[in-house]
Interface confidence: medium
């Protein structure tokens, strides 16, 4: 079932510059992507950009540059000239239309820890919330255990002291695990029927849907415009990650399709998935 992720990032160098990253985890072929702010387009939101796989992109101020990052993800750079930086508290929504079955829209905003009003640059680690106390507790136990092991190893003078240096990839994955549930639990409060699935694949986005465009009919199988940047894990340091449920091009948004309120942090990241016949393409 299609998944959409949205991540909003504030540029470290310019506190007034923001980038919205959105991705579609398939299956199906993307027909149109709409990015809006202030809510979903058509439900109080304002359209910022529209990206079409064949016809290119169009954008409206304050959008600076909209482009395809991969065959299934886009980025939108925003220029915030105002001193008060209104983007800090704004919701951004991305809608991926996959005709004729519908569209999938998710919304996200800049995490509180990225408030441009802070005098110091925001910390790259999102604030962990109360609903993650269990994870924190477990982490604490593990850290204590590691510390104790280090203590024991130091006492063995005939052995060198190991230097524990967690990899960047692992810290990103931890960030994702910690951040996603808090967003999901908030969304669940707002929509009692929402089945939240804050899933993402820790590998590149291309592994989720590497041949999406090839599944289009030949007359629509052009590569997306813009340079296809390598798709790293779709969780960036100061980003928010929200996956809401499916909407039709409803400009309706939300997310997904499981029958119960599931929370999947690392779902089955299958490779290419065949586009179902229901799409009725030639």
């Amino acid at each position: 079932t299609p998944e959409v992720w949205v991540q909003v990032q504030m540029e470290a160098t310019e506190l007034s510059s923001f980038t919205v990253h959105c991705g579609f985890l398939g299956p199906g072929s993307i027909s149109l992507v709409t990015v809006s702010w202030g809510g979903p387009d058509g439900a109080g939101g304002t359209k910022l950009a529209v990206l079409h796989p064949e016809l290119g992109t169009r954008q409206w101020a304050p959008a600076r540059q909209a482009r395809w990052e991969t065959q299934s993800s886009i980025s939108l750079a925003l220029e915030d000239s105002g001193a008060s930086s209104p983007f800090a508290n704004t919701t951004f929504c991305c809608k991926f239309a996959s005709f004729p079955e519908g569209s999938w829209e998710s919304c996200g905003s800049l995490p509180p820890s990225s408030d441009p009003g802070l005098s110091a640059p925001p910390t790259p680690v999102p604030i962990l919330r109360a609903d993650l106390a269990g994870i924190l507790g477990l982490s604490g136990v593990l850290l204590f255990g590691c510390g104790y092991l280090l203590h024991l190893l130091r006492r063995q003078k005939h052995r060198p002291t190991p230097r524990l240096q967690p990899s960047h990839t692992n810290s990103q994955a931890l960030t994702a695990q910690a951040w996603a549930p808090s967003q999901a639990s908030q969304a669940a409060l707002h929509d009692p029927y929402a089945t939240i699935n804050t899933s993402f694949c820790p590998a590149t986005l291309d592994t989720a849907h590497p041949n999406g465009w090839a599944s289009l009919p030949t007359h629509a199988a052009h590569q997306p415009q813009g340079p296809a940047a390598s798709a790293s894990t779709p969780i960036l340091a100061r980003g928010s990650f929200v996956s809401v449920e499916n909407g039709l091009y409803t400009q309706a948004g939300e997310r997904p399709p499981h029958t119960g309120p599931g929370l999947t942090l690392f779902p089955d990241c299958r490779g290419p998935r065949a586009v179902e016949g229901r799409f009725g393409v030639r």
Partner: antibody, heavy 115, light 107 residues
Framework: EVQLVESGGGLVKPGGSLRLSCAAS????????ISWVRQAPGKGLEWVSE????????YYPDTVTGRFTISRDNAKNTLYLQMSSLRAEDTAVYYC????????WGQGTLVTVSS | DIQMTQSPSSLSASVGDRVTITCKAS??????VAWYQQKPGKAPKLLIY???YRFTGVPSRFSGSGSGTDFTLTISSLQPEDFATYYC?????????FGGGTKVEIK
């Protein structure tokens, strides 16, 4: 097989209220946004409202905003349209339709607003 | 709101004829246009979506083209079961809007 079955239509006086239902089967209801589309006798199609798959987002044209409310119960696989302050011009066959655009339609239910 | 202007409002044709119906959007909708067929007393049926993609089970004699503001539905060889009313619809933005319809009648 995808099936959408509308019910709840009937005769109502101007200013009155009515609630339409749309029972869905043959697909994962909670995965799809659904719309109501109406057709006045001898006229064309008019989109009336949409609701996202979880019910969070709803959409209406100006003609019905404030009078119609779309909702859904995913546990019951049912879509609703609560209509109030009905007018003669609301007389139409009301269809529920799935997808975007509307790939699957119900058979429709007739709503007649007349004194 | 995006207005969809469909023409002609009606036409008479014979079995085997090539029929063309046009739809003009009041603003650019890229390729987000669908076409429906409706017979008296029945619900509409989706024929074409995203300008040129045939929906599941739709015969190949139906085709769509266009982009931006001008769109066309073509029936390459009209069959007896094709006599009906056809509607275009933009699925680019809310509110959804339909064309006024084109009634295809037997000559």
């Amino acid at each position: 097989e995808v099936q959408l079955v509308e019910s709840g239509g009937g005769l109502v006086k101007p200013g009155g209220s009515l609630r339409l239902s749309c029972a869905a089967s043959g697909f994962t209801f909670s995965s799809y946004g659904i719309s109501w589309v109406r057709q006045a006798p001898g006229k064309g199609l008019e989109w009336v409202s949409e609701i996202s798959s979880g019910g969070t987002y709803t959409y209406y044209p100006d003609t019905v905003t404030g009078r119609f409310t779309i909702s859904r119960d995913n546990a019951k696989n049912t879509l609703y349209l609560q209509m109030s302050s009905l007018r003669a011009e609301d007389t139409a066959v009301y269809y529920c339709a799935r997808g975007d655009p509307f790939g699957y339609w119900g058979q429709g239910t007739l709503v007649t607003v007349s004194s | 709101d995006i207005q969809m202007t469909q023409s002609p409002s009606s036409l008479s044709a014979s079995v085997g004829d090539r029929v063309t119906i046009t739809c003009k959007a009041s603003q650019d909708v890229m390729t987000a246009v669908a076409w429906y067929q409706q017979k008296p007393g029945k619900a509409p049926k989706l024929l074409i979506y995203s300008t040129s993609y045939r929906f599941t089970g739709v015969p190949s004699r139906f085709s769509g083209s266009g982009s931006g503001t001008d769109f066309t539905l073509t029936i390459s060889s009209l069959q007896p079961e094709d006599f009906a009313t056809y509607y275009c619809q933009q699925h680019y933005s809310t509110p959804r809007t339909f064309g006024g319809g084109t009634k295809v009648e037997i000559k």
